[in-house]
Amino acid sequence: TPEVWVQVQMEATELSSFTVHCGFLGPGSISLVTVSWGGPDGAGGTKLAVLHPELGTRQWAPARQARWETQSSISLALEDSGASSPFANTTFCCKFASFPEGSWESCGSLPPSSDPGLSAPPTPVPILRAD
């Protein structure tokens, strides 16, 4: 069964910077990745970035840069411009649309006790959905 993993990492050098890493474990080719925050895509979440393997990547503030790390994993850098850090308690979700499997989504967040530079474990929150 395909699986999506999500890691949220606070940058050690800049406490206002976070990076979300997501990956797809499974056969098939990825046709689109959507990164949302505040919940899953279509269920209260707000899209922050869309990545297509050949058409390119797009992101919207507070996301700074979305990029493909490998053919099956992506990263999204976020810049927290506010004085407080809303990212610390936020859920980030990655939805991978793949052929022929369909869509698979998983969510993750930074653990409350995280020190800078440490990342959330790559265990997906159990919102794995196949559309």
Epitope: G42, P53, L55, G56, R58, W60, W68, E69, Q71
Partner: antibody, heavy 114, light 113 residues
Framework: EVQLQQSGPEVVKPGASVKISCKAS????????INWVKQSHGKSLEWIGD????????NYNQKFKGKATLTVDKSSGTAFMGLRSLTSEDSAVYYC???????WGQGTSLTVSS | DIVMTQSPSSLSVSAGEKVTMSCKSS????????????LAWYQQKPGQPPKLLIY???TRESGVPDRFTGSGSGTDFTLTISSVQAEDLAVYYC?????????FGGGTRLEIK
């Protein structure tokens, strides 16, 4: 089938402002990230910016910052582009297109003339 | 900004001939992470909006005839029409889909003799 329907041609005076609309149909509106593109007469294409209908987030081509303002109305499934302080240089056909430019509106002709 | 330069600016050929047009970018459009080139080609017929033909430098959009072929990598790209038809009369644009602003080339106008 995705369709983008743009508002009709505009003829305005220099210094005025205008608002062009682009209504999306055929899918959930929040799936439509809308680009705006300028094509001056007989010239190439220029990307103006894009808007995320989920939260109204925008990205602009630096060249059009202060000239163009992109907004969305989720309830009607419509994206808008406002253009201000118009001059003859703004006379062009303006297109809306989906996120990866795979679907385009029919274009809106803007003529700035006194 | 990435500058896209197309050549020639226009060409005139007879139906059935093979046509090649070039597009060069001022910076590489290759994404090192997934080894994909973020370059697109569009066809714009008179009085119509542009139509996406090719993306990822070489992938044909659904419904595009297989006489259209995109190739190239990094900064040098080519659009080839293997056997030009009368309906291919149009201006062809390449576009940087790699980074904002998403710049277009100046276009190549294809005329049919």
């Amino acid at each position: 089938e995705v369709q983008l329907q743009q508002s009709g041609p505009e003829v305005v005076k220099p210094g005025a402002s205008v608002k062009i609309s682009c209504k999306a149909s055929g899918n959930t509106f929040t799936d439509y990230f809308i680009n705006w593109v300028k094509q001056s007469h007989g010239k190439s294409l220029e990307w103006i910016g894009d808007i995320n209908p989920d939260n109204g987030g925008t990205n602009y081509n630096q060249k059009f910052k202060g000239k163009a303002t992109l907004t969305v109305d989720k309830s009607s499934g419509t994206a808008f582009m406002g253009l201000r302080s118009l001059t003859s240089e703004d006379s062009a056909v303006y297109y809306c297109a989906t996120l990866y430019f795979d679907y385009w509106g029919q274009g809106t002709s803007l003529t700035v003339s006194s | 900004d990435i500058v896209m330069t197309q050549s020639p600016s226009s060409l005139s050929v007879s139906a059935g001939e093979k046509v090649t047009m070039s597009c060069k970018s001022s910076q590489s459009l290759l994404n090192s992470g997934n080894q994909k080139n973020y370059l697109a080609w569009y066809q714009q017929k008179p009085g119509q909006p542009p139509k996406l033909l090719i993306y990822g430098a070489s992938t044909r959009e659904s419904g595009v005839p297989d006489r259209f072929t995109g190739s190239g990598s990094g900064t040098d790209f080519t659009l080839t029409i293997s056997s030009v038809q009368a309906e291919d009369l149009a201006v062809y644009y390449c576009q940087n889909a790699h980074s904002s602003p998403y710049t277009f080339g100046g276009g190549t106008r294809l005329e049919i003799k």
